[in-house]
Interface confidence: medium
């Protein structure tokens, strides 16, 4: 057991250095906040991740840690830094008692506090029979790269690293952090403390049964026998990887993160940080049956979120429980029954489920990727991964109702050639969260900072909304949903693509008042119409209906109701062409679609008109879709006539495009 | 540095009561939580009662309520343990651990409690 005369000395000497004055405020009079996980028995009270404002250097981190120390000491409370982080995120880790946190809000630089909290492996070892030999052969599966030139860190449990699959694949690190083990009865047994790194290492990139054969791989260990670690801990293993980045700069990486805890804004923080940094890393969505965005780091957009399907494209049920789901999730990949390195013997394979297993297909996918394309960036990386996916495959009826549009249909695949995809013109759909259902409520889409906003929509199920409008939020383009009185609430949409030296810009036209509806169009030389939008502060827009079809010769325009603004984004980028095409229905119908053809890129959904009976728009993958309320409610008047109109894009030049700009 | 000494263990019969006693001396923060754990051969520590520092609330392991009482002794700086109704599966040497960084719940896992004293063993006759 350790000595700890030492904190009491360095405590003593604090209090005789710092000044009185010690509690002091915050700077600029901003009040620090303090977070914990929403899952109770996930709490781990008593140890508290201090975070510091953005541009806190070392010292001041340490400076900081001590002035709470010494305070701490004043009112007679012991406290015991932990780790001081530094090179992701400026902060501290501490012990201490929950009395002391109004104390340390107070103190200079802190941006927020938040409670450490548990994470756990996210697989289930659906059955136990070891399978020898395994269940595939070597020749059945021959990737055309196999991810040589990537590294891919597994946070995890500690694994068997003379397992015959991965043998000479993976470097365990000298990382290691974890909680003690419960419960009095628990024996540590190595092969059990092995069990899901290696089988999540022989996914990604096992000799017989990987994904990226070729691929090598680092573990940390962050997860302990029983699978489960803490936020902090997750934290330092981040941190260690970045600095590990730093010291010795190698080709791409990607992180696997395995695991899932309750959402918590500093887990979530720190994986921005690290994919701003230039790294990709892929999360399980959890195995709770839930809202991917609850839980850790699977809400965070800079992540790659996977979530389980199995061999029947359904989503994966694990015991009461299954797979997350929602807007959080970027895709599923298969999850059950997954046959990978067993941790029994060093030639034993086993069958596990989880979304752990689905994230590691997508990791081995991506080391593929990145290794045929170095270059890729995380937004084109992503776009890549959403674009090759099998689409519609995935029973719905699965998930909540109210969850299922919000839920990709997407199953994550090997692109057909791992090269040739650079003319492409790629967009993907970004849900915001729901607005809430106050009268002025709003809600924001964003997409990624290397990814262009061609376009904005919105959608409300109850139909009581008031549009949405594209805006500039911190230099960039954010697209903002408004909800309406006695609205349950609104979500915002945003269509995010990829388009290289694109120079785009909105235009608005006001309210018209006249009886011809309201337009706006392109005006400038060589930007062409990606995306209508339309806002309206009137409660309801009536039933007045403004010309469906466009005037010939016009297709840079945007028409909407008399009473709404109207608004256009038009870009101008290197050999991009776009159309519109509509698709009308003059009977009611609760949903309308209009798809692109083949070689275009849906980057604009909107609808005609824009009245009350309207729920909103929505693109999923390259079709635009419409919906109105059930028709039972809206009659077959001519007010239930809905036009779904697309804005469809293609670009030749983009391969020359991306290219110039290196 | 925080020294914790046990004492009041011995033979007992079934049925029968014994006080067990903790000492601490040396740097005691004035805000912690001292817990009673015991552990019988070839098994791991078993949390019993804790006692919070100040304020003396307690909290008892669900095998012991109704018959084990912690309590603070302010004259002697110490703790004790009051069991009563004992059993033959009490049997165990006893410890008393302090967790210097209370939390608002009390903690009943062992690595959560960073000093530790020697023991004192308890054995109950059938």
């Known amino acids: 057991q350790e000595d700890e005369d030492g904190d009491y000395e360095e405590l003593v000497l604090a209090l005789r250095s710092e000044e009185d004055g010690l509690a002091e405020a915050p700077e600029h009079g901003t009040t620090a906040t303090f977070h914990r996980c929403a899952k109770d028995p996930w709490r781990l009270p008593g140890t508290y991740v201090v975070v510091l404002k953005e541009e806190t250097h070392l010292s001041q981190s340490e400076r900081t840690a001590r002035r709470l120390q010494a305070q701490a000491a004043r009112r007679g409370y012991l406290t015991k830094i932990l780790h001081v982080f530094h090179g992701l995120l400026p902060g501290f880790l501490v012990k201490m008692s929950g009395d002391l946190l109004e104390l340390a809000l107070k103190l200079p630089h802190v941006d927020y506090i938040e409670e450490d909290s548990s994470v756990f492996a996210q697989s289930i070892p659906w059955n136990l029979e070891r399978i020898t030999p395994p269940r595939y052969r070597a020749d059945e599966y021959q990737p055309p790269d196999g991810g040589s030139l990537v590294e891919v860190y597994l946070l995890d449990t500690s694994i068997q690293s003379d397992h015959r699959e991965i043998e000479g694949r993976v470097m365990v690190t000298d990382f290691e952090n974890v909680p003690e083990e419960d419960g009095t009865r628990f024996h540590r047994q190595a092969s059990k403390c092995d069990s899901h790194g290696t089988h999540l290492a022989g996914v990604v990139s096992g000799r017989d049964a990987g994904v990226a054969k070729g691929a090598s791989m680092r573990s940390l260990r962050v997860l302990n026998c029983q699978g489960k670690g803490t936020v902090s801990g997750t934290l330092i293993g981040l941190e260690f990887i970045r600095k590990s980045q730093l010291v010795q700069p190698v080709g791409p990486l990607v992180v696997l993160l395995p695991l899932a805890g309750g959402y918590s804004r500093v887990l979530n923080a720190a994986c921005q940080r690290l994919a701003r940094a230039g790294v990709v890393l892929v999360t399980a969505a959890g195995n709770f049956r839930d809202d991917a965005c609850l839980y850790s780091p699977a809400s965070a957009p800079e992540v790659i979120t996977v979530g389980a399907t199995n061999a029947q494209d359904q989503p994966v049920t694990l015991g009461t429980l299954g797979t997350n789901f929602g807007r959080c999730v970027d895709l599923f990949a298969p999850g059950e029954d997954i046959i990978g390195a067993s941790s029994d013997c060093s030639t034993c394979f086993v069958s596990q489920s989880g979304t752990s297993q689905a994230a590691a297909h997508v990791a081995g996918i991506a080391a593929m990727m990145l290794s045929a394309e170095p270059e890729l960036t995380l937004a084109e990386l992503r776009q890549r991964l959403i674009h090759f996916s099998a689409k519609d495959v995935i029973n719905e009826a699965w998930f909540p109702e109210d969850q299922r549009v919000l839920t990709p249909n997407l199953v994550a695949a090997l692109p057909p050639s791992t090269h040739g995809a650079g003319w492409q013109l790629f967009c993907r759909t970004v849900w915001s969260a729901h607005s809430g259902p106050t009268r002025m409520a709003t809600a924001v889409a964003r997409c990624a900072p290397d990814e262009e906003l061609l376009s904005c929509s919105s959608f409300s199920r109850s139909g009581k909304r008031r549009g949405e409008r594209m805006e500039a939020q911190g230099g960039k383009l954010v697209c903002r949903a408004h909800n309406a009185f006695g609205g349950e609430g609104v979500y915002a949409i945003a269509r995010c693509c990829l388009l290289p030296q694109a120079n785009c810009s909105v235009h608005t036209a006001p309210p018209a008042e006249a009886s011809m509806g309201t337009r706006v169009h392109c005006h400038q030389q060589g930007h062409v119409l990606t995306g209508c939008s339309s806002h309206w502060e009137v409660e309801d827009l009536g039933t007045h209906k403004p010309p469906v079809l466009r005037p010939r010769g016009q297709p840079n325009q945007c028409v909407g109701h008399r009473e709404a603004s109207i608004h256009a984004s038009c870009c101008h980028a290197p050999g991009l062409e776009c159309k519109v095409k509509e698709h009308g229905i003059p009977a009611p119908q609760e949903q309308v679609t209009v798809a692109c053809e083949e070689g275009w890129t849906l980057t604009g959904c909107s609808a005609l008109p824009g009245t009350s009976h309207v729920l909103g728009a929505y693109a999923v993958d390259n079709t635009c879709v419409v919906r109105s309320r059930d028709v039972s409610t809206t009659g077959s008047t001519s007010e239930g006539a809905v036009t779904a109109v697309a804005i469809c894009c293609r670009s030749r030049h983009l391969a020359q495009a991306s290219q110039e700009l290196q | 540095q925080v020294k914790l000494e046990e004492s009041g263990g011995g033979l007992v019969q079934a049925g029968g009561s014994l006080r067990l006693s903790c000492a601490a001396s040396?740097?005691?923060?004035?805000?912690?939580?001292l817990g009673w754990f015991r552990q019988a051969p070839g098994k791991l520590p078993e949390f019993v009662a804790a006692?919070?520092?100040?304020?003396?609330?307690?909290y008892y392991a669900d095998s012991v309520k109704g018959r084990d009482t912690i309590s603070k002794d302010h004259t002697k700086n110490a703790v004790d343990l009051q069991m009563n109704s004992l059993k033959p599966e009490d049997s165990a040497t006893y410890y008393c651990?302090?967790?210097?960084?209370?939390?608002?719940?009390?903690?009943?896992?062992?690595?959560?409690?960073?000093?530790w004293g020697q023991g004192t063993q308890v054995t109950v006759s059938s």
């Open positions: 651990a302090v967790d210097p960084y209370p939390t608002p719940e009390f903690t009943t896992h062992v690595g959560h409690y960073d000093y």
């Open positions: 040396g740097r005691t923060p004035r805000h912690y939580i």
């Open positions: 006692v919070r520092e100040p304020g003396s609330s307690t």
